[in-house]
Amino acid sequence: QAVDLDALCSYTWEAVDSKNNAVYKINVCGNVGISSCGPTSAICMCDLKTENCRSVGDSLLRSSARSLLEFNTTMGCQPSDSQHRIQTSITFLCGKTLGTPEFVTATDCVHYFEWRTTAACKKDIFKADKEVPCYAFDDKLQKHDLNPLIKLNGGYLVDDSDPDTSLFINVCRDIDSLRDPSTQLRVCPAGTAACLLKGNQAFDVGRPKEGLKLLSKDRLVLTYVKEEGEKPDFCNGHSPAVTVTFVCPSERREGTIPKLTAKSNCRYEVEWITEYACHRDYLQSESCSLSSEQHDITIDLSPLAQYGGSPYVSDGREYTFFINVCGDTKVSLCNNKEAAVCQEKKADSTQVKIAGRHQNQTLRYSDGDLTLIYSGGDECSSGHHHHHH
């Protein structure tokens, strides 16, 4: 099964090669809309130093395999090389959200990207009714990524002084109320991203339409609108809308819940102070430590490494997990030196899979939570690659 591009087609996505000060605009179904890249450019690369843009992938020259999308051009790699053409290659992996295209590397001829997204999953279990891009790059080309805040079921209760109503929101996607562990959101209309509970009734007061917008280096905004359908009586003829402003705090702090700052005629303004609104390099590293200079906090997990010893064992319902954090490769899991996490099926100990690799390690500290992530594991039946937190 090929990648389901429909969910990705509605938006122009951005990726960045910060080393070379280049920004890529990506529209997997057609024209990105930058005139200097031409009318059929699917991937347009802009060099911020020279302010020149050129197409590195043509929508008319697209080819696809199950998890690979390639866009060719008619341009030679170099003036002297008419044989090889510039092209873009996007590798798709199954993910829990629409995700973001990540620049991997570029040669003279090929620009490589990787995209972990629900659009690449074999099964629909993570697919949203409606989801919008949930990240933005700032002036310094640093990424602000709210994808980790997206709830796959249920929503966030907005802090509000009104005892008669409760406003629930999700981030960048609709509230999957049917899979909500608490039953109170089951009454919310399908597709809503902002659900107002009033008495025993639920009202749709906004749906995602456009992606996250960056206002400044520490403020992002997301708007949900309810355009069609009946307007609730208490809206006084106005169409409901919810504006959520995400604010990166000025210093490290515990997470807070979203707060209602204003409401009038079903126009709700919400402010959410969260470290996820800060740029990603402030929150995470690919090593096992965070430093006070870069991350405003000092954390070092390397003492947890099992130097030559046996791995940590974690007992799950169906699987036993063997974990070797912060990688001493002398401990071989799954008979593989690259494996950081290995899972063994309890019912059948011959079924052993890599659930995460050392080279795909991310340590993240945000809103008071410390998370160590190992991705790049073997493929699951859903098309997902194992991913361990």
Partner: nanobody, 119 residues
Framework: QVQLQESGGGLVQPGGSLRLSCAAF????????MIWFRQAPGEERDIVAA????????WYEDSVKGRFTISRDNAKNTVYLQMNSLKPEDTAVYYC????????????WGQGTQVTVSS
């Protein structure tokens, strides 16, 4: 060739009004978010107001809320900034910009129009 052309700036007394227009040529206007920036002497260029491609997201800087209104007319490929109750601190060069993805790094800029609020 893409062009954004601002007009409507000028000298106005405190409390007065101006309407800035920005006409876009050579771009698929309906696909772009439109942003008004302003830059006072010696200050950074900053966003005053923005309107997304579908007009779903409209945003104002705190100091202009309730006084300025941004709107767009996709048929005329034009974005407007209605400025009421103008104050001396609104004095600046106002720039119109068009962005596909990033409001902070627009894809196209206008040349700017001077707004001076003084008695």
């Amino acid at each position: 060739q893409v062009q954004l052309q601002e007009s409507g700036g000028g000298l106005v007394q405190p409390g007065g009004s101006l309407r800035l227009s920005c006409a876009a040529f050579g771009l698929n206007f309906k696909n772009f978010d439109m942003i008004w920036f302003r830059q006072a002497p010696g200050e950074e260029r900053d966003i005053v107001a923005a309107i997304s491609s579908s007009s779903s997201t409209i945003w104002y800087e705190d100091s202009v809320k309730g006084r300025f209104t941004i709107s767009r007319d996709n048929a005329k490929n034009t974005v407007y900034l209605q400025m009421n109750s103008l104050k001396p601190e609104d004095t600046a060069v106002y720039y119109c910009a068009a962005a596909l993805t990033s409001w902070r790094r627009p894809d196209y800029w206008g040349q700017g129009t001077q707004v001076t609020v003084s008695s």
